[in-house]
């Protein structure tokens, strides 16, 4: 009686169960009544991740450097190539296929969570009592100085984009 | 959009000398550059190029006597112990692909 | 490193015909190959890239093909002014690691 289904990494074909090849292996010839599963290893640049009985192994995925990428985990003949965005740059997907440059805080707002490789910047208005002169992508609202703790006063009130002034204290003749 | 070489002169053996690539209508932030050289009655030949973030690649033939560096503007190829067989003409590149060439900078190595 | 070689060194051709120029590759490049047309005193021109894609500006008359190990540039319809020697450029890498750009030895083409 020919079998209708196939233990685990078996599979059916001419009313026969063959042995699947292992990931990192392409199948070259189906298994027959005599002869076992033939299969051969991926050649270099490409992989099959799994038990398989695919005849052409998958070309490793290119991290173009036109697009801002760069390799972030070799591939091998089971695993693909793995990308990821240059310094200073983040993917544009999940499939991180392109590369954006990271976002900076503008005057006035400051960073409040530094960008990965995956996501962008994120930036938050500085509160009362901070501010942020520059446009970074690292730098986070500073606190205003205290003139009290120097032992002077405030000639210039701080804003968000701004620190306050310090001066000295009128002296009573 | 273009880009435009300079630096090129005549130099005796062993002197350093400095290409910069100069990028018009396009910032060199968001590409590749590459540097490229072609010595007289030769054929074109790869120097290396340097990525968005500022990682160069080199030739295997380069072995650490050139370096490329770059700015928001510029790109420069460093060169040391230059001789006779470094005389070319040399050329910057925007992208791995060479969509846009300057007209080149010769250099001249001779005693 | 990976080797590109060109064939032939030179192809002669009459106005209206057809060229053909061959790059082969020592391991697979995929498609990352580009095609340049060079003039004396010029800075090369890229024609086609990522061994099909057609640059701006480049009539249609150039056609790129080929992947893997094995490339071709076709000229039709042959100007005069596609007198040149053309080049061949994998502008890829070789593996994750190593990136190179090697050219081919060039090919003259002489417009009878």
């Known amino acids: 009686e020919p079998p209708t289904a196939c233990r685990e990494k078996q599979y059916l074909i001419n009313s026969q169960c063959c042995s699947l090849c292992q990931p990192g292996q392409k199948l070259v010839s189906d298994c027959t009544e005599f002869t076992e599963t033939e299969c051969l290893p991926c050649g270099e640049s490409e992989f099959l991740d799994t038990w398989n009985r695919e005849t052409h192994c998958h070309q490793h995925k290119y991290c173009d450097p036109n697009l801002g990428l760069r390799v972030q985990q070799k591939g091998t003949s089971e695993t693909d190539t793995i990308c990821t965005c240059e310094e200073g740059w983040h993917c544009t997907s999940e499939a991180c296929e392109s590369c954006v440059l990271h976002r900076s805080c503008s005057p006035g707002f400051g960073v409040k969570q530094i960008a990965t490789g995956v996501s962008d910047t994120i930036c938050e208005p500085c509160p009362v009592g901070f501010f942020s002169n520059v446009s970074s992508a690292f730098e986070k609202c500073h606190p205003w100085t205290s003139c009290e703790t120097k032992d002077l006063v405030v000639q210039q009130a701080g804003t968000n984009k701004t620190d306050v002034v310090c001066g000295p204290q009128d002296r009573l003749r | 959009q273009s880009v435009e070489e300079s630096g090129g002169r005549l130099v005796t053996p062993g002197t350093p000398l400095t290409l910069t690539c100069t990028a018009s209508g396009f910032s060199l932030i968001g590409y590749v550059m590459g540097w490229f050289r072609q010595a007289p009655g030769k054929g074109l030949e790869y120097i290396g190029w340097?990525?968005?973030?500022?990682d160069p690649y080199y030739a295997s033939w380069v072995k650490g006597r050139f370096t490329i560096s770059k700015t928001s503007t510029t790109v420069d190829l460093k060169m040391t112990s230059l001789t006779t067989e470094d005389t070319a003409t040399y050329f910057c590149?925007?992208?791995?692909?060479?969509?846009?060439w300057g007209p080149g900078t010769l250099v001249t190595v001779s005693s | 490193d990976i080797v590109m070689t060109q064939t032939p060194a030179s192809v002669e051709a009459a106005v209206g015909g057809t060229v053909t120029i061959k790059c082969q590759a020592s391991q697979s490049i995929s498609s990352r190959l580009a095609w340049y047309q060079l003039k004396p005193g010029q800075p090369p021109k890229l024609l086609i890239y990522s061994a099909s894609t057609l640059a701006s500006g480049v009539p249609s008359r150039f056609k790129g093909s080929g992947s893997g190990t094995e490339f071709t540039l076709t000229i039709s319809d042959l100007e005069c002014a596609d007198a040149a020697t053309y080049y061949c450029q994998n502008h890829g890498y070789a593996t994750s690691e190593s990136y190179t750009n090697t050219f081919g030895g060039g090919t003259e083409v002489v417009v009878k």
């Open positions: 590149a925007r992208s791995t692909y060479g969509d846009i």
């Open positions: 340097i990525s968005f973030g500022g």
